[in-house]
């Protein structure tokens, strides 16, 4: 069974800067990621990135840069505002849309006793909505 | 089959504000961004921002920040480019487009003359 | 922001003809993570919207003609049509589909000789 891994790290040298990670782990091709925050894409959550393997990305505040780390996991660098932090609190959610297995998404977030520059354990959960 | 089909032409006089529109249909609205290009006469391609119809966030090229504003209204699967304080260098014909650049909308002539 | 360079500005040639347009990107469009190249192509015609022909560099869009073909990796990139047919007398656009804000080269007109 197809499974997606969510890791949420604030950066040490700046706290207000976090970087989602996601990756999936299963037979297929990618053909779409998608980054969301809040909940999972089209459930409650709000799209923050969409990476398309040959297409590019596109992305909205406060997503700064998303891309590809491998062929089957991406980075998302989000910049946080505000100074109360609410990514502390925040799921973010990555959906896999793969060949032929269907989309598989999986959320995560910070550990509350996050120190900075600490990741949160791989958080596989799997939402099994295999659309 | 998708489509886009965007509002008809404007005439605007200079520091004034055009709206146009883009209806789209054949896909689901909101699970598409939608992104916005125009073109100078004679001129090449410019990008300009892109659109989340599903959350209403939109992100801007900078040349364009401030005097831009990207919205939709998901009930009628509409998306809305508005460009304020508008010069004769804004005479151009704007375009939406979707699902990457793939589905193009037929352009909307913007005039800037006083 | 990237600049997108094309070349050359126009073409002239025949019909049957093989042409090789040319764009260049001021930064490498190749993402490291799974190699792949954030370079699209268009077409377009008078008085008509862009056409996407290639992306990823090298992809062809569903229903595009096999005469065209896209190379190139890194800041390099080519558009090849193989033999030039009557309908293929047009303008050509390169994209960065990488780095926002995500900028068109100035063009190659391609006409009737």
């Known amino acids: 069974t197809p499974e997606v891994w969510v890791q949420v790290q604030m950066e040490a040298t700046e706290l207000s800067s976090f970087t989602v990670h996601c990756g999936f782990l299963g037979p297929g091709s990618i053909s779409l990621v998608t980054v969301s925050w809040g909940g999972p894409d089209g459930a409650g959550g709000t799209k923050l990135a969409v990476l398309h393997p040959e297409l590019g990305t596109r992305q909205w505040a406060p997503a700064r840069q998303a891309r590809w780390e491998t062929q089957s996991s991406i980075s998302l660098a989000l910049e946080d505002s505000g100074a109360s932090s609410p990514f502390a609190n925040t799921t973010f959610c990555c959906k896999f849309a793969s060949f032929p297995e269907g989309s598989w998404e999986s959320c995560g977030s910070l550990p509350p006793s996050s120190d900075p520059g600490l990741s949160a354990p791989p958080t596989p959960v799997p939402i099994l909505r295999a659309d | 089959q998708v489509q886009l089909v965007q509002s008809g032409a404007e005439v605007k006089k200079p520091g004034a504000s055009v709206k146009v529109s883009c209806k789209a249909s054949g896909y689901t609205f909101i699970n598409n961004f939608i992104e916005w290009v125009r073109q100078a006469p004679g001129q090449g391609l410019e990008w300009m921002g892109v659109?989340?119809?599903?959350?209403?966030?939109?992100n801007y090229a900078q040349k364009f920040q401030g005097r831009v504003t990207m919205t939709r209204d998901t009930s009628i699967s509409t998306a809305y480019m508005e460009l304020s304080r508008l010069r004769s260098d804004d005479t151009a014909v704007y375009y939406c487009a979707s699902h990457w650049l793939a589905y193009w909308g037929q352009g909307t002539t913007v005039t800037v003359s006083s | 922001e990237i600049v997108m360079t094309q070349s050359p500005p126009t073409l002239s040639l025949s019909p049957g003809e093989r042409v090789t347009l040319s764009c260049r990107s001021s930064?490498?469009?190749?993402?490291?993570?799974?190699?792949?190249?954030?370079l699209s192509w268009y077409q377009q015609k008078p008085g008509q919207a862009p056409r996407l022909l290639i992306y990823?560099?090298?992809t062809r869009e569903t229903g595009i003609p096999a005469r065209f073909s896209g190379s190139g990796s890194g800041t390099d990139f080519t558009l090849t049509i193989s033999s030039l047919q009557p309908e293929d007398f047009a303008v050509y656009y390169c994209?960065?589909?990488?780095?926002?804000?995500?900028?068109f080269g100035g063009g190659t007109k391609l006409e009737i000789k």
């Open positions: 659109i989340n119809p599903g959350s209403g966030d939109a």
């Open positions: 994209q960065n589909g990488h780095f926002y804000p995500y900028t």
């Open positions: 990823g560099a090298s």
């Open positions: 930064q490498s469009l190749l993402s490291s993570g799974n190699q792949k190249n954030y």
